[in-house]
């Protein structure tokens, strides 16, 4: 299934894009997957479809579920799925992992924090920014367009940053928040040429046809916060995003720190419903930092 995960908070606006690529003006129909009931396009409804976009104004926990979008044309239709989860607002300041967008890293030279998903909304500047739930104040913080710039970044600037903005739809305003972690390059730390812990180079993994399997790419880059440290999978030398096989999905890298202080990153490649053709692909685990690139290759074989 060609699907995409989206999440939001109750009583906030959530806008989801159909995962099937299409241009503006294409005809897109949306349905509740469970009931096959069409989602209305009239803007007076709390949940309505607007071309490529599905709008929850505002979202409710009960909206959680899978939504089907069909890019229609007179001779050829394309179907995608949006997996939407709406969470209750947290009573305390803690933002759980499942509400976090991808982590960004910064340094004294580069401290931009982009507000996730904001491009989907009709918003006007300025954004409000919070760190660990406290409103950011002072001349060091500059809200610029859709990102936050921090001057003279220090290690204690690391933390969870939330952007808050107002989405306007036909004169009505809806709040939206999005949170992501910001890490700061630790001057006391150091970085090394990447070391891939798993998989071993030229490893072969046995899999069952029709089953699901996970491949973990795990690499370490040195001690302390790393300015650039990415771990990703490639298929036959292509990025996963370029390959666009919906059964094969790469999770965002998870940062890990070991007792010896090593900064490591794990990225999991999930392969659903393993097919014969997957056995012919070359799976490359790539670890990249400022020192260079290391690659370990793994192949799949039938059990």
């Amino acid at each position: 299934k060609f699907s995409k995960q989206s999440w939001g908070l109750e009583n906030e606006a959530l806008i989801v894009r159909c995962p099937r690529q299409g241009k503006s003006s294409y005809i897109v129909d949306w349905y509740y997957s469970q009931t096959n009931k069409s989602i209305p396009t009239q803007e007076r409804n709390r949940v309505f479809a607007s071309g490529q976009l599905l709008k929850f104004l505002p979202a409710e926990v009960a909206d959680s579920g899978i939504y089907t979008c069909i890019v229609r044309s007179p001779t050829f239709n394309r179907t995608g799925y949006a997996n939407v989860t709406i969470y209750k607002k947290q009573p305390d300041c803690n933002v759980p992992d499942y509400l976090m967008y991808s982590t960004v890293s910064g340094s004294e030279k580069n401290s931009k924090i982009y507000c996730p998903t904001i491009d989907l909304y009709n918003w006007t500047a300025p954004l409000e920014w919070f760190k660990n739930c406290q409103a950011l104040q002072g001349s060091r913080y500059k809200a610029h367009k859709s990102f936050l710039v921090i001057d003279n970044v220090m290690t204690d600037d690391a933390g969870d940053y939330t952007c808050k903005f107002i989405h306007n739809e036909n004169g009505a305003n809806y709040s939206v928040t999005a949170t992501r972690s910001f890490t700061v390059k630790d001057e006391q730390g150091f970085s090394l040429f990447p070391v891939i812990r798993a998989p071993a180079h030229n490893e072969t993994k046995e899999v069952e046809i029709g089953e699901n399997t996970n491949l973990t790419c795990s690499a370490c880059f040195g001690k302390g916060a790393q300015f650039l440290a990415t771990v990703q999978w490639q298929l036959n030398g292509n990025k996963i995003t370029d390959f666009s096989e919906p059964r094969i999905q790469q999770e965002e890298g998870q940062n890990q720190s070991f007792s010896n202080g090593l900064a490591c990153v794990n990225t999991v490649l999930r392969i659903a419903d393993v097919k014969e053709e997957d056995l012919l692909l070359r799976y490359d685990c790539l670890a990249l930092n400022l020192h260079g690139l290391r690659r370990h290759t793994i192949r799949l074989s039938r059990k």
Epitope: F2, Q21, Y26, S73, F76, D242, F243
Partner: antibody
């Protein structure tokens, strides 16, 4: 980035079958789009021939239906054109192209085919 | 089959002037509020490149001097102001039904 590349024999004798291959890189042909064959005759006229969709469904130009087939090899991310009983009228540049239900977005560079004895 | 007739077959336009190319369909290519007409540019030795989709929408990366209009059976591609690099052949194409067909093409020469 999606890239398509046609390959074929260049020269075919009349009454024989023509087989062309389109190799797609940067995108899986089973994940989206319809994968088409389009030809351009020496006078520049363009003709859509047929497609195979991401799900494996096919559709053909009725003018060619009796002698065309489009198949694929998902393990190699390739799709193929077979045209039977060719005549000199089938001399053309053959393009493969992706189709999103609306327009042909990505095209190969084309391969020239001459039908001659 | 829907026959697309392009006119003129060729035209020569001075730099900075307007080029207008017409495409007429033998039956309507519009349905449910959308016109399934597309325009492509082709330069020698290259495949066609999409310029305009759904009659009037500019494809990403295409200069704003290209514009499309029309509905039903009559469609127009305009280029203004014409530039040196616009010398090429232009084709209309419909996707209203199978078979998809193309117009005969219009060759634009820059004077």
């Amino acid at each position: 980035e999606v890239q398509l590349q046609e390959s074929g024999p260049g020269l075919v004798k009349p009454s024989q079958s023509l087989s062309l291959t389109c190799t797609v890189t940067g995108f899986s042909i089973t994940s989206d789009y319809a994968w088409n064959w389009i030809r351009q005759f020496p006078g520049s006229k363009l003709e859509w021939m047929g497609f195979i969709s991401y799900s494996g469904d096919t559709s053909f130009n009725p003018s060619l239906k009796s002698r065309i087939s489009v198949t694929r090899d998902t393990s190699k991310n390739q799709f193929f054109l077979q045209l039977n009983s060719v005549t000199t009228e089938d001399t053309a540049t053959y393009y493969c192209a992706s189709y999103d239900g609306y327009s042909f977005d990505y095209w190969g560079q084309g391969t020239t085919l001459t039908v001659s004895s | 089959d829907i026959v697309l007739t392009q006119s003129p077959a060729s035209l020569a336009i001075s730099l900075g002037q307007r080029a207008t190319i017409s495409c007429r369909a033998s039956k309507s290519v519009s349905t449910s509020g959308s016109s399934y007409m597309f325009w492509y540019q082709q330069k020698p030795g290259q495949p066609p490149k999409l310029l305009i989709y759904l009659a009037s929408n500019l494809e990403s990366g295409v200069p704003a001097r290209f514009s499309g209009s029309g509905s039903g059976t009559d469609f127009t591609l305009n280029i203004h102001p014409v530039e040196e690099e616009d010398a090429a052949a232009y084709y209309c194409q419909h996707s209203r039904e199978i078979p998809y067909t193309f117009g005969g093409g219009t060759k634009l020469e820059i004077k």
